[in-house]
Amino acid sequence: AGVFELQIHSFGPGPGPGAPRSPCSARLPCRLFFRVCLKPGLSEEAAESPCALGAALSARGPVYTEQPGAPAPDLPLPDGLLQVPFRDAWPGTFSFIIETWREELGDQIGGPAWSLLARVAGRRRLAAGGPWARDIQRAGAWELRFSYRARCEPPAVGTACTRLCRPRSAPSRCGPGLRPCAPLEDECEAPLVCRAGCSPEHGFCEQPGECRCLEGWTGPLCTVPVSTSSCLSPRGPSSATTGCLVPGPGPCDGNPCANGGSCSETPRSFECTCPRGFYGLRCEVSGVTCADGPCFNGGLCVGGADPDSAYICHCPPGFQGSNCEKRVDRCSLQPCRNGGLCLDLGHALRCRCRAGFAGPRCEHDLDDCAGRACANGGTCVEGGGAHRCSCALGFGGRDCRERADPCAARPCAHGGRCYAHFSGLVCACAPGYMGARCEFPVHPDGASALPAAPPGLRPGDPQRYL
């Protein structure tokens, strides 16, 4: 057993450009407090777990009001250390999260408002009993300077707080098989203290607080003789009285896992899978409650009013994990339909829709022609999220409002002359050509390449385009 101690030295603007605005103002005075969360190990999956080594909340710092026009200085800090007690061995490698919180003290509806100013995280190796380790971490434009250490609570000593020391009973030497306790040479390493109540005849331990059974005995305290009436789980030597194989003491016999933990055998011992809210070798340590603030990113802590009840984090949109510690890339689910652009704003998801589509997820296909009138007898044609007008003869433009010059495109072939006409255009063809656009040559023998011209029109007459 022992205590992890964290000393915050300063929290303020980091070096370099872009100094942050002061978090407090004359209108909105505030004060800081800190939260630390510890997890065992260096592995990435530690992020999924709750603060299994423990968590602590600092006191509130002094009230701070920004001086108008002044840059944000180092902010006034709470007094004292943040202390995280641990019951089991110190793991040697650990992950930490340190959060700096602001408490606004203005007139708030529904009490004070809290907001997270900065969060730093890291993974470190640390031996218990060593000196203070200093650290500097940056979060955005803020900088946090702090020191930390792990120390054992007597009588535990050692880099993992697993060795126990007692004052020497004799002035000169320790008992048989027991070494002096470095660095406390006047103390001796104590024999291991097994779990309270562990049978001295049938139990033993290799770790403090353990109770392992000798063959033929079982139960959490090794006080229950193994039944010889059943031969279903042969594990031990043959019993002379029954001819059965007496089940030897399997590591999970009597389920050493407390608080509803489930036991699984490992090659060397056993492993407990603990329910939420419990941890430790045998799930014997509880105490992560909602008061410890285990839910990150604004998650609501549901349940967990006392150490015996589990908590569940109800996460805000965009976060998941048992402690809301994982940001979800919600755009990877491609929620925007019809080619919309997805924007994850953190607190909300936005879809920027292509022309012709609308709705929170661009799910509505707009009727491009709805409410769009094409003037002068034009008709609206839908297409690709935009509308266009197919204009009646003599009109053009986006809405057919412009009067078209039918001769602008030089529609009369072979040198024919174009005349604008109220119903369109008329081509006056050059000699030797005919047709609405003067596109057909007249044959030298007087026959045309077309059927005979309509009655009343001779070749060479202006041909009106209808």
Partner: nanobody, 120 residues
């Protein structure tokens, strides 16, 4: 400003049922959770059930299977259906709303509370 008005509390025998309602008025930010927390005399306050604006629900393990939460977004109302009530469910039940503005900024609102008493 958000106002929350609870109703439906009262006295009930063990094994009985009650339905609490909470109506929110005022302007509620669209990204939020509405729910119920309770406080028994001398105990920590405890969120019992929460439902987000996107429909996700969370119920405390201690009441799972007995309490259900539902929400009518159109009416900005949240309901807590409590059945198989036990003596340990006796508490003042408060309606609460958490508005999330970002991952580091949110605000809580709470109602006046309604007393639920479970006794034989």
């Amino acid at each position: 400003e958000v106002q929350l008005v609870e109703s439906g509390g009262g006295e009930v025998q063990p094994g009985g049922s009650l339905r609490l309602s909470c109506a929110a008025s005022g302007s509620i930010f669209s990204i939020n959770a509405m729910g119920w927390y309770r406080q028994a005399p001398g105990k920590q306050r405890e969120w019992v059930a929460v439902v987000s604006s996107d429909g996700r629900t969370t119920v405390a393990p201690s009441v799972k299977g007995r309490f259900t939460i539902s929400r009518d977004n159109a009416k900005n109302t949240v309901y807590l259906q409590m059945s198989s009530l036990r003596a340990e469910d006796t508490a003042v039940y408060y309606c609460g709303v958490r508005e999330w503005y970002s991952d580091s900024d949110w605000r809580d609102y709470e109602g006046q509370g309604t007393l639920v008493t479970v006794k034989p």
